[in-house]
């Protein structure tokens, strides 16, 4: 059904990292425009990105209201210049997205090593607690604030002079590891949500090495 001038959107795909969430779809419009609606399973539809020629719509503001809810979106197609026109059944063409639960599915962004500090044969490595767009009481929550203990970090570390990697894990954003005196080490971290079935791990952080500016070295 639908007018001869419009085609239904297809390949509706959620792209989400640290709760920044965009719905993408195809095709690029030719003589048509799109409007997106989003809803929770039990809620009302809310329209976004009215009559757009884009093939993406930022739905972050909606999903951050409750990241544990499951959302459904749909993309309506309208003839350009005649958005009141509907399909033969009296409705504009539309296509549903897959369901999306931000808490369970948003990709974990690449973490950053905030600092490292050596004290004797111990090195304290701190992972930056990245701010998300999830708000509570008018403040933006960090990744740790949102995920709590569901989020762990894995630290990979190795002597600059060798390739043998060691690992440590933490339920916080800090590590305290033993190192050999007089040796320089390199570090990389990864965010992990072990309880997930999909999107469990982030990409590895950029590598940071001792003897470079980010860290601090104290011989005690």
């Amino acid at each position: 059904s639908g007018t001869t001038n419009t085609v239904a959107a297809y390949n509706l795909t959620w792209k989400s990292t640290n709760f920044k969430t965009i719905l993408e779809w195809e095709p690029k419009p030719v003589n048509q425009v799109y409007t997106v609606q989003i809803s929770t399973k039990s809620g009302d539809w809310k329209s976004k990105c009215f009559y757009t020629t884009d093939t993406e719509c930022d739905l972050t503001d909606e999903i951050v209201k409750d990241v544990k809810q499951t959302y459904l979106a749909r993309v309506f197609s309208y003839p350009a210049g005649n958005v009141e026109s509907t399909g033969s059944a009296g409705e504009p063409l539309y296509e549903n997205s897959p369901e999306f639960t931000p808490y369970l599915e948003t990709n974990l962004g690449q973490p950053t090593i905030q600092s490292f500090e050596q004290v004797g044969t111990k090195v304290n490595v701190t992972v930056e607690d990245e701010r998300t767009l999830v708000r509570r009481n008018n403040t933006f929550l960090s990744l740790r604030d949102v995920f709590g203990k569901d989020l762990i970090y894995t630290l990979y570390y190795w002597k600059s002079s060798s390739s043998g990697k060691k690992t440590a894990k933490t339920n916080t954003n800090e590590f305290l590891i033993d190192v050999d005196k007089g040796e320089n080490y390199c570090f990389s971290v990864q965010a992990v949500i072990p309880s997930r079935t999909v999107n469990r791990k982030s990409t590895d952080s950029p590598v940071e090495c001792m003897g470079q500016e980010k860290g601090e070295f104290r011989e005690i």
Partner: antibody, heavy 125, light 108 residues
Framework: QVQLQESGPGLVKPSQTLSLTCTVS?????????WSWIRQHPGKGLEWIGE???????RYNPSLKSRVTISVDTSKNQFSLKLSSVTAADTAVYYC??????????????????WGKGTTVTVSS | EIVLTQSPGTLSLSPGERATLSCRAS???????LAWYQQKPGQAPRLLIY???SRATGIPDRFSGSGSGTDFTLTISRLEPEDFAVYYC?????????FGGGTKVEIK
């Protein structure tokens, strides 16, 4: 040092909602720890109910999830438990506890190191 | 959920003897998430061991923990009168966090 104190009615009628509050003294509820509720049925073992972070992030026992709400009030340094539709099977001693980070194996993990004394809640008409 | 089975249910020993308490998990538990608690009548539990083998602050060195995977052990090298209590193992690596059924260490 941190101390916890549970408060709330000791008697709740069946089908009603059990409401308990845990007051944290000697430290801030916002200081990077988690705050838990655990219960112990008469003469039995311990059952974890759920936990909350100061940000409001929660984890619940799936067996109780549909009936449980844990909330935090950072301004009062308190966190609370609500358990709806109670039955006699919810009669227990209810404990609140702090889950604090301890160093282990290169990282930090949380353990319940400070507990309240516990409050007995009886569900009966 | 991970079921923790403690044995024996009751251990009858005399002061000065060695107590060995077992905790077996229904599936593998990361040692980082395994703790032991002591509970005396009318009191709240007290953290003894965390990370399977590390003593909590103020815990005497007669208490030690060991094990990995599915088998964990709490050992009290020489029982003191104040050690007679119920001991629980607990895991908080997987929701729901679970406790073992407890082992009662009583005076023989």
């Amino acid at each position: 040092q941190v101390q916890l104190q549970e408060s709330g009615p000791g008697l709740v009628k069946p089908s009603q909602t059990l409401s308990l509050t845990c007051t944290v003294s000697g430290g801030s509820i916002s200081s990077g720890q988690y705050w838990s509720w655990i219960r112990q049925h008469p003469g039995k073992g311990l059952e974890w109910i759920g936990e909350i972070y100061y940000s409001g992030s929660t984890r619940y026992n799936p067996s109780l999830k549909s009936r449980v709400t844990i909330s935090v009030d950072t301004s009062k340094n308190q966190f609370s438990l609500k358990l709806s539709s109670v039955t006699a099977a919810d009669t227990a001693v209810y404990y609140c506890a702090r889950d604090a980070p301890y160093y282990y194996g290169g990282g930090y993990y949380y353990y319940m190191d400070v507990w309240g004394k516990g409050t007995t809640v009886t569900v009966s008409s | 959920e991970i079921v923790l089975t403690q044995s024996p249910g009751t251990l009858s020993l005399s002061p000065g003897e060695r107590a060995t308490l077992s905790c077996r998990a229904s599936e593998s538990v990361d040692s980082s998430y395994l703790a032991w608690y002591q509970q005396k009548p009318g009191q709240a539990p007290r953290l003894l061991i965390y990370g399977a083998d590390s003593r909590a602050t103020g815990i005497p060195d007669r208490f030690s923990g060991s094990g990995s995977g599915t088998d964990f052990t709490l050992t009290i090298s020489r029982l003191e009168p104040e050690d007679f209590a119920v001991y629980y193992c607990q895991q908080d690596g997987v929701v729901p966090y679970t406790f073992g059924g407890g082992t009662k260490v009583e005076i023989k």
